[in-house]
């Protein structure tokens, strides 16, 4: 560093704790939405909610922030024919997705509120509502039973009235449909012309029940009971239906497909074809087959368009084909072999003859690299756009490709926006504009294009107090790197410290997630608590995506498969071990840490042995780590490690019980929430009783009654401190012992 | 609630006029491509005529050019539909459709299908007799 540039950086602040929870650090994403070909609806920083027209350049507002502001509302929804906005308040979160609420319906702009009820209840909690595609038309659910209301005004109306709390949920998911299969609380789907609604009917009435405990508040702690099941154990069953909502409710259930590897199955993704054709895709308990299907929504009958299977497991099940307006023509992403490093995911198209029962398929797309989502397509300009990993696996551009003749591609992103390399973007009805997301790696912002020439149209929000907070503080440098493990290239990202210099030793920080399939080395604007401990703390971060992570195909997806931890423990090493042959790495001050998946393999790897049968790492942390995959859930543990009770030898090699025993002098905190939903705190009882048995140190924080997912802010505050404050006195714990060593070697002279 | 309303069907002797109109919410009605459409027994749903109500540019099928007219009243939200010198084979029920929101360019070359339109009218009779 030059003089000049050291004094610039020296008056620059650290990042702290109290800056990941200040509002100069606080993202403000638009949350704009499409509703035509020229208009999206936005949210200002400030609030108010206003509707955008691109062709003539005006805005106008719909919901003044103040009236947000006065109803408490966390939620707001505009009707389609923009005449009344729907808010939601007293939001209270049951799971990741999942909550309860009180609604309000609004006329715009300034109408007074009018609630939300079933017929038989006044001031009802709602576990959901909504609005239909046309005009005013809502749908709302109370007590597992589906509500329909043609237009506000009108008497609602209970289409479906087989739902049983807890146990048989229509039109919404249940834990495990929620967290694992489609990811979202929502199990229902309109029709596009608003004449239908398909919803799940999820059944848990043999699924086991867990019960979580609640300590605090009462003399007695009470439990909450709910239905989870554990890998090998039950599982909720599913069906599909179609109910008409013009005229009397006729309810039809899509028939599943005759197939006897489909004896217990999921439903990953529904999707509307048309307004009387509904793609479903069936996915088999071992989650090895899924079967495509267009279903009529008239008769129930499911025609099979599609199918995969997989020697290990099928990877992204949920993602919806795009279709033609008559729906004849579907473009849908599948593994396709491209040659030594497996299947990745490409751009298939699909074309239904009206005379055959053939369908034409072909690929759209090919390479090394995957499509990882198709955005819109265009009928009239033969084109579908999409975003990829073409450029790098931890870059998202956006593309376009022809969808006849050539195919040929072109990149709409790629150097349109500065310091900007990972996007999410959307497209106007017509496809002649669109909202373009950058993500990162610079501070997140939205711009409009138009879609002939890519042209900035305009910034609706740059985030600009964000950038001057960064401006204003010691950022990490980020560095990529590329280490070479068993033939393949492993990226890595390093953070430094701002003020780095290769003379200076650091430690060492290894972070881990490894869920299979996820990415953590990604071009992405983050300031975490990992940014403090880089930033105030003066460690050097590294992160690697190791054989069983994704977009790099699917060889290297499913090597982990039957042997989760074993390959992801030599990928992290060989990473720490890259860093250990840096002079500016102190390998006296390494650590780990990870949560969930990652609590996992910080718990698995923080025993490993270095090259001269010393230990690497001085300390570890996991935060409500998995610890033994037949506690965790069905759909995940029997995804990688294969169906419990058929061949248990996956699932006992893949405890962390028989690591733990290796634990030396390390530090190991562990983290738990006792309330946790996702990853039972039985987890965490289960390692410490073997951590005792192994007579190995731990240092165990509980949160009591808190969730998974850590839902206050002054407890994610605290969280943490806790993990800064263990790794920092880790650390300096090593300060004290090499002074205490360097004394003793002068007296020896 | 209704988002369109015809008025103006009914019965006519070929080589008459009729005027249709289409009263339309200021939510569909603002900046929406607006079109008539007809459909005869047995036949396909077919354009007729279009208007974009931001532009005012208008655009017609073939079998209508000359004949009709389409035009547009900003204060009342209402398009018309002005039908000259009418024929046998314009006897079919009428209906309004309009697309809110819709860019100018593709009202007028692209929209010309009933599933390119999102709003609907329940449709007017016009029968022309000999």
């Known amino acids: 560093l030059t003089p000049a540039e050291d004094n610039s950086l020296s008056q620059k602040k650290k990042v702290t704790v109290e800056d990941l929870f200040s509002e100069d650090f606080k993202i403000h994403d638009p949350e704009a939405k499409w509703i035509s070909d020229t208009e999206f609806i936005y949210r200002e920083q400030k609030g108010t909610v206003r509707l955008w027209n691109v062709e003539t350049n005006t805005s106008t507002v719909l919901i003044e922030g103040k009236k947000i502001e006065s109803l408490r509302a966390i939620r707001y929804e505009i009707s389609p024919d923009r005449e009344y906005a729907l808010f939601s308040y007293n939001v209270e979160p049951i799971y990741q997705h999942s909550y309860t609420g009180y609604y309000v319906l609004s006329k715009i702009p300034h109408g007074d509120p009018q609630s939300l009820d079933p017929p038989e209840v006044s001031n009802a909690k709602l576990q959901y509502a909504g609005w239909g595609p046309k005009g005013q038309q809502l749908i709302f659910i109370f007590e597992n039973n589906i509500y329909y209301c043609a237009h506000v005004g009108k008497q609602a109306i209970r289409v479906v009235s087989t739902g049983k709390e807890g146990v048989i949920y229509n039109g919404l998911s249940d834990w495990l449909y929620e967290e694992e299969i489609l990811k979202t609380h929502i199990a229902h789907w309109w029709s596009p012309d608003g004449t239908r609604l398909a919803y799940a009917a999820i059944n848990d009435s043999r699924v086991p029940i867990m019960e979580l405990p609640t300590y605090t508040g009462s003399i007695y702690p009470t439990v909450k009971p709910y239905h989870y099941p554990k890998a090998g154990s039950e599982n909720p069953s599913i069906s599909l239906h179609v109910i008409g909502l013009n005229g009397p409710t006729h309810d039809l259930e899509m028939m599943p497909p005759d197939d006897p590897r489909m004896r217990e199955y999921y439903i990953t993704m529904v999707k509307w074809a048309t307004s009387t054709k509904v793609a479903v895709t069936w996915l088999n308990r071992a989650q090895n087959v899924s079967i495509l299907t267009l279903c009529d929504a008239t008769t129930g009958v499911c025609t099979k368009k599609h199918e995969d299977e997989s020697e290990a497991w099928l990877h992204r099940q949920n993602e919806e084909p795009v279709f033609s307006k008559d729906g004849r023509k579907f473009f849908f992403i599948r593994a396709i072999p491209q040659g030594g490093r497996g299947k990745f995911y490409h751009i298939t198209v699909s074309s239904s003859q009206p005379n055959s029962s053939n369908d034409n398929i072909q690929s759209i797309t090919s390479g090394d690299w995957d499509v990882t989502k198709i955005l819109a397509y265009d009928e009239k300009g033969n084109k579908i756009y999409f975003l990829s990993t073409e450029d790098l696996p931890r870059r998202r551009q956006l593309y376009s490709a022809n969808t006849v003749g050539n195919f040929n591609r072109q990149c709409l992103s790629c150097d349109l926006v500065e310091n900007c390399t990972y996007f999410s973007a959307s497209f106007s009805h017509s496809m002649d504009f669109f909202l373009l997301k950058c993500e990162g790696p610079g501070v997140p912002m939205v711009t409009v294009h138009n879609t002939t020439d890519k042209k900035k149209m305009f910034d609706l929000e740059t985030n600009e107090h964000v950038k001057k907070a960064i401006n204003d503080r010691q950022m990490p440098k980020v560095e990529y790197r590329d280490i070479e493990i068993d033939d393949y290239n492993l990226p890595m990202q390093i953070l430094k410290p701002a003020t780095f210099t290769d003379t200076t030793h650091y430690p060492l920080l290894l972070v881990v997630d490894g869920t299979p399939g996820s990415q953590s080395v990604a071009e992405k604007f983050e300031v975490s608590w990992e940014t403090v401990m880089v930033s105030s703390h003066g460690a050097v971060v590294v992160k690697c995506d190791g054989r069983g992570s994704g977009f790099q195909g699917t060889k290297l997806l499913h090597e982990v498969r039957r042997r989760l931890g074993l390959l992801e423990e030599k990928d992290q090493m060989e990473a720490v071990r890259t860093m250990l042959k840096e002079q500016y790495i102190d390998r006296t001050r390494v650590a780990v840490f990870g949560k969930d998946y990652g609590g996992y393999l910080s718990t698995y790897i923080l025993p490993a042995k270095g090259e001269n049968q010393g230990q690497t790492f001085t300390c570890g942390s996991a935060l409500s780590p998995i610890t033994d995959f037949k506690l965790y859930a069905s759909a995940f543990s029997e995804r990688y490690l294969g169906l419990h009770g058929l061949d248990n030898r996956a699932y006992e090699m893949t405890k962390v019980a028989h690591r733990v025993s290796a634990l030396e002098e390390q530090q190991f905190l562990i983290i738990h929430p006792t309330a946790d939903e996702k990853i039972h705190f039985q987890h965490t009882a289960e390692l410490i009783t073997q951590l005792i048995r192994g007579k190995a140190n731990y240092s165990l924080q509980i949160y009591p009654d808190e969730s998974h997912y850590f839902t206050s802010s002054s407890l994610k505050q605290h969280l943490y401190r806790s993990i800064i404050n263990f790794f920092v006195e880790c650390f300096r714990i090593q300060d004290k012992l090499l002074t205490v060593t360097a004394k003793e070697d002068e007296e020896e002279d | 609630q209704v988002q369109l309303q015809e008025s103006g069907g009914g019965s006519v002797q070929a080589g008459g006029s009729l005027r249709l109109s289409c009263a339309a919410s200021?939510?569909?009605?603002?900046?929406?491509?607006m079109a008539w459409f007809r459909q005869a027994p047995g036949k396909e749903r077919e354009r007729v005529a279009s208007i974009h109500t931001g532009t005012g540019t208008a655009n017609y099928a073939d079998s209508a050019k000359g004949r009709f007219t389409i035009s547009q009243d900003i204060a009342a939200n209402t398009v018309y539909l002005q039908m000259n010198s009418l024929k046998l084979e314009d006897t079919a029920m009428y209906y309004c459709a309009a697309r809110p929101g819709s860019a100018a360019l593709r009202c007028t070359t692209d929209y010309s299908k009933p599933h390119d339109f999102t709003y609907w009218g329940q449709g007017t009779q016009v029968t022309v007799s000999s």
């Open positions: 200021s939510y569909t009605y603002s900046y929406s491509c």
